[in-house]
């Protein structure tokens, strides 16, 4: 159950990040708002009415709304996480699970040609699960992961656009490129 | 007022089965998150499931995927299936409320759990 | 697992005296502990919750303190029915524990 109800969120590598909780609006019925993550098997942070809000470590601030904020996430941030929220007499009143991955954002993409045999190259150098696409004059051509090698050969001039992507950032590269007739390095 | 009746409890050989039942009444028993706990003969007293008002499951280590903790909250009832039992398993098993998710502040009568051969 | 440690395992005092029982965690828990009274033939009833709170019912007499690892439950004038096994439990991490119980004597 932990799992399937689980709401999937992204952060990324070295960003804060916060796990706000949909759907919750805070009252004077809450007295508990507990973090716990999973794989730690512990409460991470807990506030509780009239009482100091406890934190594991600086690294974590509640808000008074209940969102949790993870700062300068680190690779092993990345977990299930599970709130749960109590009325003044105990009673459970909302859990939610959040499964939070973690990516490192993606670099500049990088454009490189050859006007020897017309070959243009785009290469991401950095980040998790990137997503290249290259576009020739506004029309796509390839899509691929790290890099893309593309000959062209509808004219020596155009403008290429290279995107990089994951699900914490996006880069994208504009390039002119310009061919002599000969075909001149 | 709040009460918890648990029963079910018996005598088993090793490898056995039993379904302990808690029968909840005085208290809103689909809003709480409830407990089995058990008692050594002993006397060391040592938590052993949970399952929280919106259905989440939690185990100790020595009983996971041999115990199962379950609840109907349309009849108020909660129960632990316990399957391939061992003789470390003998104890009092006793149903409690989870206040907060936390501290037991109601707790059944207890029943007994024996597994010897 | 979070091991809670009790001492001593017996007390024995005097009616009227003040007692005081330890309960100490492996790694520091907050404020997330929990004392119980089990008489000889009963249940286990919450006494104090997150170490220094009061529970409903309870008399006066019995109060809580402490934070991070170490933990006292204190009884400030002790009468004859609270002759009982106490127990702590923390609730900071899964699985729950309990301490191995401190039994209280009357002279």
């Known amino acids: 159950k932990e799992i399937t109800n689980a709401l999937e969120t992204w952060g990324a590598l070295g960003q804060d990040i916060n796990l706000d909780i949909p759907s919750f609006q805070m009252s004077d019925d809450i007295d508990d708002i507990k973090w716990e993550k999973t794989s730690d098997k512990k409460k991470i942070a807990q506030f509780r009415k009239e009482k100091e809000t406890f934190k594991e470590k600086d690294t974590y601030k509640l808000f008074k709304n209940g969102t949790l904020k993870i700062k300068h996430l680190k690779t092993d941030d990345q977990d299930i996480y599970k709130v749960s929220i109590y009325d003044t007499k105990g009673k459970n009143v909302l859990e939610k699970i959040f499964d939070l991955k973690i990516q490192e954002r993606v670099s500049k993409p990088k454009i490189s040609w050859t006007c020897i045999n017309t070959t243009l190259t785009c290469e991401v150098m950095n980040g998790t699960d990137p997503e290249l696409n290259l576009y020739q004059d506004g029309k796509h051509l390839k899509l691929s992961q790290r890099v893309i090698t593309h000959k062209w050969t509808t004219s020596l001039s155009a403008k290429f656009k290279c995107t990089a992507g994951n699900k914490v950032s996006k880069e994208s590269s504009v390039e002119p490129v310009s061919c002599p007739e000969k075909g001149l390095d | 007022e709040v009460k918890l009746v648990e029963s079910g409890g018996g005598l088993v050989k090793p490898g056995g089965s039993l379904k302990l039942s808690c029968a909840a009444s005085g208290f809103t028993f689909s809003s709480y998150d409830m407990s089995w706990v058990r008692q050594t003969p002993e006397k060391r007293l040592e938590w052993v499931a949970s399952i929280s008002g919106g259905g989440f499951l939690y185990y100790l280590d020595s009983v996971k995927g041999r115990f199962t903790i379950s609840r109907d909250n349309a009849r108020n009832i909660l129960y632990l299936h316990m399957t391939s039992l061992r003789s470390e398993d003998t104890a009092m098993y006793y149903c409690?409320?989870?206040?907060?998710?936390?501290?037991?502040?109601?707790w059944g009568q207890g029943t007994s759990v024996t597994v010897s051969s | 697992d979070i091991l809670l440690t009790q001492s001593p395992a017996i007390l024995s005092v005097s009616p009227g005296e003040r007692v005081s029982f330890s309960c100490r965690a492996s790694?520091?828990?907050?404020?997330?502990i929990h004392w119980y009274q089990q008489r000889t033939t009963g249940s286990p009833r919450l006494l104090i919750k997150y170490a220094s709170e009061s529970i409903s019912g309870i008399p006066s007499r019995f109060s809580g303190s402490g934070s991070g690892t170490d933990f006292t439950l204190s009884i400030n004038s002790v009468e004859s029915e609270d002759v009982a096994d106490y127990y702590c439990?923390?609730?900071?991490?899964?699985?729950?524990?309990f301490g191995g119980g401190t039994k209280l004597e009357i002279e």
């Open positions: 439990q923390q609730s900071h991490g899964w699985p729950f524990t």
């Open positions: 409690a409320r989870s206040s907060y998710g936390e501290l037991m502040d109601y």
């Open positions: 790694q520091r828990i907050g404020t997330s």
